[in-house]
């Protein structure tokens, strides 16, 4: 893996220490020939969680175009999911316009959908 990236199970991961909105985070990953992390299994979930710590962090899952989709095209419906209870809820009550279209790790690793413009940390992934 490149310097400052961490290898696990055939992928390399980079963990940010600053925050960006989801679209900017995905663009950052793309500039590194990577994408926001696609969580494919319980073991990968735990690995990422260990490195991220108890911090909100964007992952490569969005429903901005309708159904939930992983950024690399991995099938969402048949794949791994770790939503927190009652999530995703596309909550409009924040009063900031629209619902919640981007997924992130919460403090305990469970997933939540949130406004894509929130400046959360993020995780990039690329194949080794």
């Amino acid at each position: 893996c490149p310097v400052n990236w961490v290898g696990y199970e055939g992928s390399c991961y980079w963990f940010s220490r600053s925050g960006k909105p989801w679209p900017e985070a995905e663009k950052y990953c793309q500039l590194e020939n990577a994408h926001l992390v696609v969580v494919g299994s319980w073991e990968e979930q735990k690995f990422i969680q260990h490195h991220v710590g108890p911090v909100n962090s964007w992952i490569g899952l969005t429903d901005q175009s309708g159904p939930w989709k992983w950024v690399d095209g991995t099938d969402y419906e048949s794949g791994f999911k770790n939503w927190r209870p009652e999530q995703p809820d596309d909550w409009y009550g924040h009063g900031l316009g629209g619902g919640e279209d981007c997924a992130h790790f919460t403090e305990d690793g469970g997933w939540n959908d949130d406004i894509c413009q929130r400046p959360y940390r993020w995780v990039c992934e690329t194949q080794r």
Epitope: S41, W42, F80, N82, E107, D108, G109
Partner: antibody, heavy 117, light 107 residues
Framework: QVQLVQSGAEVKKPGASVKVSCKAS????????LHWVRQAPGQGLEWMGW????????NYAQKFQGRVTMTRDTSISTAYMGLSSLRSDDTAVYYC??????????WGQGTLVTVSS | DIQMTQSPSSVSASVGDRVTITCRAS??????LAWYQQKPGKAPKLLIY???SLQSGVPSRFSGSGSGTDFTLTISSLQPEDFAIYYC?????????FGPGTKVDIK
């Protein structure tokens, strides 16, 4: 050595609730997820969900959502599994099990819950 | 949900025999599969994790292989204490699911 010690057998009437405990020792309780698995008499194994003892976060199998509650008390390194609105087909041995690498590496001895009128 | 199937459902064998049990997942689970042994009235015991890694303290006559959808547990030389039910379990995604079990009994 790692040990998970569960509470004793219970007999409940249909519609009642039960709460099973699982006391952990031999490792740092808050470092590992704990799962609950049940096994009806003469049947196979069925995963019910997990709790993260550090955060209290849970993930329940859809089949049990609305009836199961998993909690923990970190001060005594104990996890609990509550199941409500019991039916006769909830009669089973209930196990707690520690999360390992793609597995459950340590199991409690099991708690038999019998639901009978 | 990912469905797990096992074959055979039961096998009669003698001490010293080589026994092979197969497990199939309804969709790919990489190598995230475990094997357990269960004896009557006891909790399951972990034998193999990550499809092929031997759990500490488990005899080396047990081995596992496979990836994706097809997996195998092999007992190279069956011992008297090995007569039990064996379950596979996928730990790739929720809900975690188990195979129906394979009973290994004395011929």
């Amino acid at each position: 050595q790692v040990q998970l010690v569960q509470s004793g057998a219970e007999v409940k009437k249909p519609g009642a609730s039960v709460k099973v405990s699982c006391k952990a020792s031999g490792y740092t309780f808050t470092d590992y997820y704990l799962h609950w698995v049940r096994q009806a008499p003469g049947q196979g194994l069925e995963w019910m969900g997990w709790i993260h003892p550090n955060s209290g976060g849970t993930n329940y199998a859809q089949k049990f959502q609305g009836r199961v509650t998993m909690t923990r008390d970190t001060s005594i390194s104990t996890a609990y599994m509550g199941l409500s609105s019991l039916r006769s087909d909830d009669t089973a041995v209930y196990y707690c099990a520690r999360d390992g690498t793609s597995s459950f590496d340590y199991w409690g001895q099991g708690t038999l819950v019998t639901v009978s009128s | 949900d990912i469905q797990m199937t096992q074959s055979p459902s039961s096998v009669s064998a003698s001490v010293g025999d080589r026994v092979t049990i197969t497990c199939r997942a309804s969709q790919g689970i990489s190598r995230w599969l475990a094997w357990y042994q269960q004896k009557p009235g006891k909790a399951p015991k972990l034998l193999i994790y990550g499809a092929s890694s031997l759990q500490s303290g488990v005899p080396s006559r047990f081995s596992g292989s496979g990836s994706g959808t097809d997996f195998t547990l092999t007992i190279s030389s069956l011992q008297p204490e090995d007569f039990a039910i064996y379950y596979c379990q996928q730990a790739n995604s929720f809900p975690f699911t188990f195979g129906p079990g394979t009973k290994v009994d004395i011929k």
